[in-house]
């Protein structure tokens, strides 16, 4: 906390300029008018204020705007944003995408900080939904952003926004998140033809149900093993050997290398061994020939 002291004669700042870097911290406090600072915030970034001088400037803005900064000031915070706490940011009402971009630019190249997470949260809540332009912006700065959201938060993503999503944006999503995103992606891409559709939907298939996988198996999509391994186990189990063969196409040979890993392992256990043998891959662990398989879950559903 800087003491309140009178500004020395002739040192009162008439504008925010580089001469201020040679002021002592108490002189900045005493000689820089907070309202002047607020109107000339865009200049601060171009002036090499020290780490602690920026604390003084922040303190002045905090006194001027105890209820939170107006967006006209927020948009020009620049590196002063790094001095803000999540508590400060919770007082803000950020509605402009330009403001959001300007502040994300300051943090570019760094991990998402608590400040940035709070800023994004405030922005998205203010907008009511995660629209395409916002999602475009956020995933450009933070590819893992989408997967940091809860399934509940993801439910506010409109299908039209899915066009902004790149495969790498989904790398860290878990099945619960893909369960929410997949139906939106299916809706978003529904008017595309077979091969184009598969290219777009592929990253989201970790949320696909069995019937959709069966439908894909009829379209010669040649799904790669990496995608297959990310499918929901419960969606893969009911697929027949013939359906998996059609789904994977030439990639079916990769099943051998994955036979001990889910979902391949669990799927093998559900197939008849003689069906598995037709693949000629040496997959073992299927149901021996002559055994009857009772689907108890179906029986329970009927009773």
């Amino acid at each position: 906390e800087v003491e309140k002291t009178a500004c020395p004669s002739g040192k009162k700042a008439r504008e925010i300029d580089e001469s201020l870097i040679f002021y002592k911290k108490w002189e900045l406090e005493a000689c820089v008018d907070a309202a002047l600072l607020a109107t000339q915030m865009d200049r601060v970034n171009a002036i090499p204020f020290t780490y602690e001088q920026l604390d003084v400037l922040k303190h002045k803005l905090d006194e001027l705007y105890p209820q939170g900064y107006p967006e006209s000031v927020i948009q020009h915070l620049g590196y002063l944003f790094l001095k803000m706490s999540p508590e400060d940011i919770r007082k803000w009402n950020v509605t402009s995408l330009e403001t959001l971009k300007a502040l994300l630019e300051v943090n570019k190249g760094h991990e998402m900080s608590p400040q940035v997470a709070t800023l994004i949260d405030r922005f998205v809540k203010g907008r009511g939904q995660l629209d395409k332009d916002t999602l475009d912006t956020l995933t450009a700065f933070y590819p893992g952003y989408l997967c940091s959201l809860s399934p509940e938060e993801l439910s506010s993503v409109p299908p039209s926004s899915i066009w902004a999503v790149r495969p790498q944006d989904l790398d860290t999503c878990d099945p619960r998140q893909l369960d929410v995103l997949y139906p939106k992606a299916r809706l978003a891409f529904q008017n595309m033809n077979g091969s184009e559709y598969f290219v777009k939907i592929q990253s989201f298939l970790g949320g696909a149900p069995t019937e959709d996988l069966k439908a894909l198996s009829q379209q010669n999509v040649s799904m790669d093993l990496a995608t297959f391994m990310k499918l929901r186990t419960d969606a893969v189990l009911p697929l027949t050997v013939a359906e998996v063969q059609k789904l994977l196409g030439p990639h079916v040979e990769g099943l051998k290398a994955e036979e001990r890993h889910r979902p391949v392992r669990d799927w093998i256990l559900r197939q008849r061994q003689d069906d598995l043998d037709t693949l000629g891959l040496g997959l073992q662990g299927g149901i021996p020939n002559g055994y009857l398989v009772l689907d108890l879950s179906m029986q329970e559903a009927l009773s």
């Epitope: 002021y23 911290k25 970034n45 090499p48 020290t50 780490y51 602690e52 620049g78 590196y79």
Partner: nanobody
Framework: QVQLVESGGGLVPAGGSLRLSCAAS????????MGWFRQAPGKEREPVAV????????YYADSVKGRFTISRDYAKNTLYLQMNSLKPADTAVYYC????????????WGQGTQVTVSS
Amino acid sequence: QVQLVESGGGLVPAGGSLRLSCAASGRTFSTYSMGWFRQAPGKEREPVAVISWIGGSTYYADSVKGRFTISRDYAKNTLYLQMNSLKPADTAVYYCAATKSEWRDPDYWGQGTQVTVSS
């Protein structure tokens, strides 16, 4: 213990160039602004150029604008001053400084390196 060690000074003819370096050790200087000051014989030490702790914003004294360029390499913890079109008036001991707080009283100083520009 924090140390700022300057190098690159020397004797150069008017119109020539020099590049000063300042190697910082003993701590991480990521939140420190860094700068170059100089002191000519019989004169006070004066700021030459300053670079921000983040973002690369700079300050130059009017007398060196357009001739000198300050830069820093965060990975190497090193500050540079590229001096072109040198004049006899640039003759001085050049000091590297680092501060988190105030340029009127920097936290750390180097020992200085002599630059002499002959006419």
